[in-house]
């Protein structure tokens, strides 16, 4: 099981002489996941030219990747802690199926892909403890996720490579938005 970053992650921060607050632990945890995404993006960009491709829009139509918008209450203007936290948790839950898709997409970084997936599950648990309005959080239907996974895995090689690239890029941006918003909570 993944350790909690900030306690054991050498890349992220200096050793602490005092315990981290809950917010700081979450911050370090997201930074740990972002390190993992960076490593996976490196492998993806090295093995294909997807990172420079201008044909992203073609594949993006097949995906419904969560994205932060002003209405979600996570931006400085109109910031709303409860609304924002619901959006973050809902978005992370929606990303889970895409992280599952990534599991068989890496050769040299297979463990890293697993670590990103597991650390995201831990992050969701952290945030659910923080959320007051759990009723507002919608969990994706397992059957919907299963059929989406089948559909993604049935794509041709080029589309699968592009999908991998888009998932990593979107998940990175979503986490970065989360990081910024959670620092206000």
């Amino acid at each position: 099981a993944p350790v909690l970053p900030g306690e054991d992650s050498k890349n992220v921060a200096a050793p602490h002489s005092q315990p981290l607050t809950s917010s700081e632990r979450i911050d370090k945890h997201i930074r740990y996941i972002l390190d993992g995404i960076s490593a996976l993006r490196k492998e993806t960009c090295n093995r294909s030219n997807m990172c420079e491709s201008s044909k992203e829009a073609l594949a993006e139509n097949n995906l419904n990747l969560p994205k932060m918008a002003e209405k979600d209450g996570c931006f400085q203007s109109g910031f709303n802690e409860d609304t924002c936290l619901v959006k973050i948790i809902t978005g992370l839950l929606e990303f889970e199926v895409y992280l599952e898709y990534l599991q068989n997409r890496f050769e040299s970084s297979e463990e890293q892909a697993r670590a990103v997936q597991m650390s995201t599950k831990v992050l969701i648990q952290f945030l659910q403890k923080k959320a007051k309005n759990l009723d507002a959080i919608t969990t994706p239907e397992p059957t919907t996720n299963a059929s989406l996974l089948t559909k993604l895995q049935a794509q041709n090689q080029w589309l699968q490579d592009m999908t991998t690239h888009l998932i990593l890029r979107s998940f990175k941006e979503f986490l970065q938005s989360n990081l910024r918003a959670l620092r206000q909570m």
């Epitope: 921060a13 390190d35 932060m68 931006f75 203007s77 990175k172 938005s177 990081l179």
Partner: antibody, heavy 122, light 107 residues
Framework: QVTLKESGPVLVKPTETLTLTCTVS??????????VGWIRQPPGKALEWLAH???????RYNSALKSRLTISKDTSKSQVVLTMTNMDPVDTATYYC??????????????WGQGTLVTVSS | EIVLTQSPDFQSVTPKEKVTITCRAS??????LHWYQQKPDQSPKLLIK???QSISGVPSRFSGSGSGTDFTLTINSLEAEDAATYYC?????????FGQGTKVEIK
């Protein structure tokens, strides 16, 4: 390599509005995690953070000056613009723009422009 | 607002000497503290991030330590080119604030 360059008037009159432009190169204003901030330094004094804008257009202002500041960006021109209304002689300072953020959306400035000295005087 | 207080305000040091600058935060900021160097008539330059993480291209004689409210910037063997004002910055919460600066002069 990453560079930032400030441009704008060197002299403004009291009550006027200051408009400063920061032109960046070596990185994109739309890269997730990145942003550009403005910091000023009155002669012989310490640094003061004014405002910043992120890749997705989220903005943040120093609350003490918020009513006077507006920050915006034009990604296609690689420019960030700061306007400051109702200028006063105490606003005389060197104004810097700097790159902020990175993978961890760091709250730090890793590259700075050379700064532009703005004098407020009638 | 988090207030950062640096000490000393001024230090006159001979080359090869060790320099220690401290920065104290008015409340705990974990390791979200960054250090900058500003040479006369130049813009600031990032020296150390997250209290102790080194920056590529910055000489290894510069190091940082601390966590919570008390932080230290150390210059291990001062060189003439290190004459500058050093600032700490709160990167924990808004507004981002800076210390008042410590001016290091070469004797």
């Amino acid at each position: 390599q990453v560079t930032l360059k400030e441009s704008g008037p060197v002299l403004v009159k009291p009550t006027e509005t200051l408009t400063l432009t920061c032109t960046v190169s070596g990185f994109s204003l739309s890269t997730s995690g990145m942003g550009v901030g403005w910091i000023r330094q009155p002669p012989g004094k310490a640094l003061e953070w004014l405002a910043h804008i992120w890749w997705d257009d989220d903005k943040r202002y120093n609350s003490a000056l918020k009513s006077r500041l507006t920050i915006s960006k034009d990604t296609s021109k690689s420019q960030v613009v700061l306007t400051m209304t109702n200028m006063d002689p105490v606003d005389t300072a060197t104004y810097y723009c700097a790159r902020i953020g990175g993978l961890y959306v760091d709250y730090l400035m890793d590259y700075w422009g050379q700064g532009t000295l703005v004098t407020v005087s009638s | 607002e988090i207030v950062l207080t640096q000490s000393p305000d001024f230090q006159s040091v001979t080359p090869k000497e060790k320099v220690t600058i401290t920065c104290r935060a008015s409340q705990s900021i974990s390791d979200y503290l960054h250090w900058y160097q500003q040479k006369p008539d130049q813009s600031p330059k990032l020296l150390i991030k997250y209290a102790s993480q080194s920056i590529s291209g910055v000489p290894s004689r510069f190091s940082g330590s601390g966590s919570g409210t008390d932080f230290t910037l150390t210059i291990n063997s001062l060189e003439a080119e290190d004459a500058a004002t050093y600032y700490c910055q709160n990167g924990h919460s808004f507004p981002w604030t800076f210390g008042q600066g410590t001016k290091v002069e070469i004797k």
